[in-house]
């Protein structure tokens, strides 16, 4: 049985340019201990979108909805969306390691598409 599940409930999200995009992520446990980060893209070239522990991410805010007893909310909202923000976003759990944290499990990803700003 899985020790922890990373749930990204939405396969895709479509947002008008200039609006905010909410990217949902829930986890079934805090264990194993370690940080949660958001990335755009996968593999070596992926871009870090949010890491609560360190860094400056002025367009990103955390969004915790109504708390559920059986999971933990690690959703984010990205403001002032532009076409350059399009891509697939992954919520990733890391396991605390020494000297470096180790990627433990990733969500399935949410594809963000950007619509033209309504005229």
């Amino acid at each position: 049985e899985d020790e922890l599940q990373v749930i990204q409930p939405e396969k895709s999200v479509s947002v008008a340019a200039g609006e905010s995009a909410t990217l949902r992520c829930a986890m079934t446990s805090l264990i194993p201990v370690g940080p949660i980060m958001w990335f755009r893209g996968a593999g070596a070239g992926r871009e870090l979108i949010y890491n609560q522990k360190e860094g400056h991410f002025p367009r990103v805010t955390t969004v915790s909805e109504l708390t559920k007893r059986n999971n933990l909310d690690f959703s984010i909202s990205i403001s002032n969306i532009t076409p350059a923000d399009a891509g697939t976003y992954y919520c990733v759990k890391f396991r605390k390691g020494s000297p470096d944290d180790v990627e433990f499990k990733s969500g399935a990803g949410t594809e963000l598409s950007v619509r033209a700003k309504p005229s």
Epitope: E1, D2, E3, L4, T28, S29, L30, I31, P32, V33, I36, Q52, T62, V63, S64, T67, R69, N70, N71, L72, D73, F74, S75, I76, R95
Partner: antibody
């Protein structure tokens, strides 16, 4: 009804060993993170050890690291705390507790008393 | 380690009145909008019982006269109105970072 029943406490001399057990029923044991928390009149509540739902990951505070070992048998719905090199300051009531999300302690057993004294 | 300072150590409140208990953490216990601070009630001879999880969420079966509030480092448990069966010791607990730590407890009595 959720039940956590601890056993194995008792009187032991400094440097000695004890093995505490916790028998779980009334919930899906294999889905829960499990922990031990102890309570002393002087120090209040103190977290002692935690194990992940599948048993792969264990965590301990510095006060017991290297002396205590936590394990579980999901087939038997049981949790075990092996305590070695016991010290007087380990004297406490030891509670078994469940954590659905590895966060708050959902349910607690009635506790078992460990006394370390010569 | 995150140190939790709980106050007051004891509290005497009249039946039907409001009881307020505070916990202050030495650093933020928030992560992604979740506040990993929880509250427990312990009556003599019994184990602790979960009342409030993640700062403000009432555990199932707990009367709604109990409520929790706060974020980052400052948290409050409120009992209003206080009933005779609420006489107990109350503890807060943080699970934001290891080692998990508890407040020293607040003993609530009837005035």
């Amino acid at each position: 009804e959720v039940q956590l029943v601890e056993s194995g406490g008792g009187l032991v001399k400094p440097g000695g060993s004890l093995r505490l057990s916790c028998a779980a029923s009334g919930f899906t044991f294999s889905s829960y993170v499990m922990s031990w928390v102890r309570q002393t009149p002087g120090k209040g509540l103190e977290w002692v050890a935690t194990i992940s739902s599948g048993g792969t990951y264990t965590y301990y505070p510095d006060s017991v690291k290297g002396r205590f070992t936590l394990s579980r048998d999901n087939a038997k719905n049981s949790l075990y705390l092996q305590m070695n090199s016991l010290r007087a300051e380990d004297t406490a009531v030891y509670y078994c507790a469940s954590q659905l999300t590895g966060s708050e302690f959902d349910y607690w057993g009635q506790g078992t008393t460990v006394t370390v004294s010569s | 380690d995150i140190v939790i300072t709980q106050s007051p150590a004891s509290l005497a409140v009249s039946l039907g009145e409001r009881a307020t208990i505070s916990c202050r953490a030495s650093e933020s216990v928030d992560s992604y909008g979740n506040s990993f601070m929880h509250w427990y009630q312990q009556k003599p001879g019994q184990p602790p019982k979960l009342l409030i999880y993640r700062a403000s969420n009432l555990e199932s079966g707990v009367p709604d006269r109990f409520s929790g509030s706060g974020s980052r480092t400052d948290f409050t448990l409120t009992i209003n109105p206080l009933q005779a069966e609420d006489v107990a010791t109350y503890y807060c607990h943080q699970s934001a970072d290891l080692p998990w730590t508890f407040g020293g407890g607040t003993k609530v009595e009837i005035k």
